[in-house]
């Protein structure tokens, strides 16, 4: 069956270059026009570029024209997107997408590859407790959590009690701070009565920096 | 370039409902229009092409219509798998413009948030920064307003919000708002409060603490 497997994404500094690849299988690559489409975090789909099956026709979105170049190697069944002079606003998941026969809609999509354009360097998070107190108790339910602050790049994973606690957990999407570093919170609601007896530990893993933190969250002792 | 405008941007519906999404082109595109469905973290999936032709394997409850500049995608009877974001795309011209998307979410009943406030940890204060977190838990609908007050003075520009995707079990949302200050600024003030306004609350709810007190 038709498959488009993407590679080449990653973190790159503004002004630098990156090349994305889209390896095709399950069809005669040289007969098909393939496009690039991108999606900025939390945003909609944006068409980026197209190269016709014979290489004669290339077309680019205004936002990337003159900076991005699309190319293909039919002997390797691979489409490329060379991205130069990258900007923070180019941060997105990039998809390659194949048309259906000659009609220019997208019948088959790659899995997507994330490109992050930032001047920040890889950094592991600081993990701080969000301690339960009378201010975080409501009707027999207490809230507690962990603040996972100042890391780069995405993602981090957060579990509670090594995955044993899942009910009542909310791990929020990360926000990009003005520093260029990410921050997120993970919270859990538990019975107030359990605070004295049950141990609550958030397990934070940031693979890019090889950082693992287990933080015990307990009521503040006054 | 041909611009594509979708409406509504968000649509709340229940299983079994008939829902309709509209897409308008800034100039005629004949019937060169496709519809896609996208779920979080996944690539889009083709549903419909040439305005009304159903892609192979797509259920017949998806119905496309229109020509020229006005198009609709109708889901005749919404199923749990259909809660997703839908995009239209014109392929009449070189720039294959997409609509901005329509998110179809689960229609719940009004649920007021439970509100919690967390002071910065001593551990964080040692690093020179103070983050105060306000948590709004399990509310519906999504629209909620959080205002930070420090010694009763309204704060602006120094907080960030994050909202969860709609919960797959109970269709509620949760929100965290983080007020970030330097340790020096944090220690200049006493009362930290977050005020929450939501349709499920008859009046705004305020949660607060006094710095340095338990």
């Amino acid at each position: 069956q038709v498959q488009l497997v993407q590679s080449g994404g990653g973190v790159v500094q503004p002004g630098r270059s990156l090349r994305l690849s889209c390896a095709a299988s399950g069809f005669t690559f040289s007969r098909y026009t393939i496009h690039w489409v991108r999606q900025a975090p939390g945003k909609g789909l944006e068409w980026v570029a197209v190269m016709s099956y014979n290489g004669n026709n290339k077309h680019y979105a205004d936002s990337v024209n003159g900076r991005f170049t699309i190319s293909r190697n039919d002997s390797k069944n691979t489409l490329y997107l060379n991205m130069n002079s990258l900007r923070p606003e180019d941060t997105a998941v990039y998809y390659c997408a194949r048309i259906r026969d000659t009609a220019m809609f997208f019948a088959h999509w790659g899995q997507g590859t994330l490109v992050t354009v930032s001047s920040a360097s890889t950094k592991g998070p600081s993990v701080f407790p969000l301690a339960p107190s009378s201010k975080s108790t409501s009707g027999g339910t207490a809230a507690l959590g962990c603040l996972v602050k100042d890391y780069f790049p995405e993602p981090v994973t957060v579990s509670w009690n090594s995955g044993a606690l899942t009910s009542g957990v909310h791990t929020f999407p990360a926000v990009l701070q003005s520093s260029g570093l990410y921050s997120l919170s993970s919270v859990v609601t538990v019975p107030s009565s359990s605070l004295g007896t049950q141990t609550y530990i958030c397990n934070v893993n940031h693979k890019p920096s090889n950082t693992k933190v287990d933080k015990k969250v307990e009521p503040k002792s006054c | 370039d041909i611009q594509m405008t979708q409406s509504p941007s968000t649509l709340s519906a229940s299983v079994g409902d008939r829902v309709t999404i509209t897409c308008r082109a800034s100039q005629s595109i004949n019937t060169w229009l496709a519809w896609y469905q996208q779920k979080p973290g996944k690539a889009p999936k083709l549903l419909m092409y040439k305005a009304s032709s159903l892609e192979s394997g797509v259920p017949s409850r998806f119905i496309g219509s229109g020509s020229g500049t006005e198009f609709t995608l109708t889901i005749s009877s919404l199923q749990p798998d259909d809660f997703a974001t839908y995009y239209c795309q014109q392929y009449n011209s070189d720039s294959k413009m997409f609509g901005q998307g329509t998110k179809v979410e689960v229609k719940g009943t009004v649920a007021a948030p439970s509100v919690f406030i967390f002071p910065p940890s001593d551990e964080q204060l040692k690093s020179g920064t103070a983050s105060v977190v306000c948590l709004l838990n399990n509310f519906y609908p999504r629209e909620a307003k959080v205002q930070w007050k420090v010694d009763n003075a309204l704060q602006s520009g120094n907080s960030q919000e994050s909202v969860t995707e709609q919960d797959s079990k109970d269709s509620t949302y949760s929100l965290s708002s983080t007020l970030t200050l330097s340790k020096a600024d944090y220690e200049k003030h006493k009362v930290y409060a977050c005020e929450v306004t939501h349709q499920g609350l008859s009046s705004p709810v305020t949660k607060s603490f006094n710095r340095g007190e338990c």
Epitope: - | S14, D17, D170, S171
Partner: nanobody, 112 residues
Framework: QVQLQDSGGGLVQAGGSLRLSCAAS????????MAWFRQAPGQEREFVSS????????NYLDSVKGRFTISKDNAKNTVYLQMNSLKPEDTAVYYC?????WGQGTQVTVSS
Amino acid sequence: QVQLQDSGGGLVQAGGSLRLSCAASGRIFSTHTMAWFRQAPGQEREFVSSISWNGAVTNYLDSVKGRFTISKDNAKNTVYLQMNSLKPEDTAVYYCAAGRNWGQGTQVTVSS
């Protein structure tokens, strides 16, 4: 945890009756429209009936109107589909649904 548990299917002769049950977690039951869908072998899953969160609004597939009745029991957090005058073409797996959740399905077979 399981959000929707459907049951009550079985083998019944044409003209007979069955009552399907869908037990739901409290939050889903009290805040969501709940619906029944069915899928016959080799067919698409189709809508059968729905009932609003407060029980005030019900809807039915045209071919089951007058034969099927949907109801809910607030005390038991359960939605029912009473199926009378069953026909061989009602043979399908019946699924309860609410929000993004499906029940596991219960088989109804109507023999002629």
